[in-house]
Amino acid sequence: QPSVSPGEPSPPSIHPGKSDLIVRVGDEIRLLCTDPGFVKWTFEILDETNENKQNEWITEKAEATNTGKYTCTNKHGLSNSIYVFVRDPAKLFLVDRSLYGKEDNDTLVRCPLTDPEVTNYSLKGCQGKPLPKDLRFIPDPKAGIMIKSVKRAYHRLCLHCSVDQEGKSVLSEKFILKVRPAFKAVPVVSVSKASYLLREGEEFTVTCTIKDVSSSVYSTWKRENSQTKLQEKCNSWHHGDFNYERQATLTISSARVNDSGVFMCYANNTFGSANVTTTLEVVD
C-alpha cells in the first residue's frame, strides 16, 4: 500500500494484497476492503460497471464473466484496485464485437483475456487469411488488442483474437472492422448546366452532383448573396466503399423574372469546402 503522512487520508486496503489475482472457474472470489470510510466496490469489465455497497465482495462460483477490475473507494474519493482473472479453458476471451475504426486513428479490439498465462496473444485473419502486412497492434490482456493507425484498406477486415494454449492456437469469435474514412480532400461538386435562359412560367430544374468518401459530407443549394436555404430533393448512392454520390436537385416549378440570378451548390466536409454555380435568366 502507498505510504502516507499521519493524519492524511489514505487509500483503502484490499485483501488479498496483490494487483492481480487468478482464480479457477467455479471457485470462490472473496475480496475484502478495509477502510473506516468504506463507500463501495466497483466491478468493471469491457467498460461496463457494477457496484456493491458491502465491504466484502463474495462471488461463490466464479464465472469467466467475473473477470475484471475490482475497485474499492472510500469517502475521501481514494481508491485501490485488484484485477481478477477467472481462468476458464472453455472461455478464454470476453468479447464485444462492435468494432469501428476511424482512418488514421487507433481502435481497440475488445477481447480481454480470462487467463493471463496463455501465450502469443495476437490478432489473426479469418479463414486462415493473413492480416494486412502493415497492420500493427499492441496486445493488453486486460483490455484487448489495439490496432494502430487504422487504414482505409482495412474496411470490413475479418479477424480473430488469438492465443496459444497448451501448444494449440485458440481463436475468439469473429470481429469485422468497419472503417470510417477521414476526409483528405474537399468534396467534388459539379452542376448539370452552367447557365439557363427561360421564359416566365417555365420550370427551372438544376442538379448538383456531390462526390465524396462518405455520406457525412454536407451540401446545400443557396442563392448567391443570400443565406436562405433553398428547397431541394436529394438522391444518394454508395458506389462501393468510400465512393459516395449525392444528387441535389433544385426546382422552381414556375420561374419568374425576379428568380433570375446566380445559384450556388455548396458542399463541405472536415477538410474544406467546394462550390459550383449556375446562372438563371428569366425573360418575360
Epitope: D47, E48, T49, S98, Y100, K102, C158, I176, R180
Partner: antibody, heavy 117, light 111 residues
C-alpha cells in the same frame, strides 16, 4: 447496471427546435456508440443516426440529415439530439440506444415529442 | 438502403403453439458468415427489447422459447411454445450497412 435516462415528453411549437437528452450510467460513456431511433405509428422504427464513441464523430440516415443533430457531453455522460424546424411529421417517440457487441442492447424509455401550436 | 420486409403483419396463435415470423432483406446482411440481423420485442408504452442477436444468438435473460435462424437475406424468429406474455410487436433490424433499418413489425396476438 446500464441505464439510459430520457425525459418523458416535450411539447413544442411548429417551426421551433427541441434538444432532448439521454443520460447514461453503468458504463464508460466514451467507450460505446449511441444511436437514436424514431418511432411513429405510421412509419414504425427508423434509425436516425449514431454518435461514435471516443471522438464524437456522427453518421446520419440521409433522411434525417439537416433535421437532426447528435452531440455528446462526456463530462455528464449525456448524449443529445436536437431536431430543428419542427413540423407535425416530427411528432414521435425518440429513443436513444447503446450499441453493445454489435446490437442495440440497451434502450432509453423514449421521449415523446408533440409538435402543436 | 436495405429494405426489410416482415411477414405476416399480424398473426394470432393459440397458447402453447408455435409462432413463426419471417424477415426478408432486399440484399444480404452477411459478412464472413456473420449475419448482422437482430430481433426485438416491443410492448405498448415500452422501448424495444433485444431478443436475438446476430441472427441466432439468444440475448442473456431471454427465455429459450425464442429462437432465430437464417442467413444472407432470409431470417426467421420462432416462439415455441407461445405464452400469454409474448403478445407484442416483433421487429427485425439489420446493421450490416448504413442506414440501419428495421422491418415493419409483426403484431402477435395470443388466442
Amino acid at each position: 447496471q446500464v441505464q439510459l435516462q430520457q425525459p418523458g415528453a416535450e411539447l413544442v411549437k411548429p417551426g421551433a427546435s427541441v434538444k432532448m437528452s439521454c443520460k447514461a450510467s453503468g458504463y464508460t460513456f466514451t467507450s460505446y456508440n449511441m444511436h437514436w431511433v424514431k418511432q411513429t405509428p405510421g412509419q414504425g422504427l427508423e434509425w436516425i443516426g449514431v454518435i461514435y464513441s471516443g471522438n464524437g464523430d456522427t453518421s446520419y440516415n440521409q433522411k434525417f440529415k439537416g433535421k437532426a443533430t447528435l452531440t455528446a457531453d462526456k463530462s455528464s455522460s449525456t448524449a443529445y439530439m436536437q431536431i430543428n424546424s419542427l413540423t407535425s411529421e416530427d411528432s414521435a417517440v425518440y429513443y436513444c440506444a447503446r450499441e453493445r457487441d454489435t446490437r442495440f442492447g440497451n434502450w432509453g424509455q423514449g421521449t415523446l415529442v408533440t409538435v402543436s401550436a | 438502403n436495405i429494405v426489410l420486409t416482415q411477414s405476416p403483419a399480424s398473426l394470432a396463435v393459440s397458447l402453447g403453439l408455435r409462432a413463426t415470423i419471417s424477415c426478408r432483406a432486399s440484399e444480404s446482411v452477411d459478412i464472413y458468415g456473420n449475419s448482422f440481423m437482430h430481433w426485438y420485442q416491443q410492448k405498448p408504452g415500452q422501448p424495444p427489447k433485444l431478443l436475438i442477436y446476430l441472427a441466432s444468438n439468444l440475448e442473456s435473460g431471454v427465455p429459450a422459447r425464442f429462437s432465430g435462424s437464417g442467413s444472407r437475406t432470409d431470417f426467421t424468429l420462432t416462439i415455441d411454445p407461445v405464452e400469454a406474455d409474448d403478445a407484442a410487436t416483433y421487429y427485425c433490424q439489420q446493421n450490416n450497412e448504413d442506414p440501419y433499418t428495421f422491418g415493419g413489425g409483426t403484431k402477435l396476438e395470443i388466442k
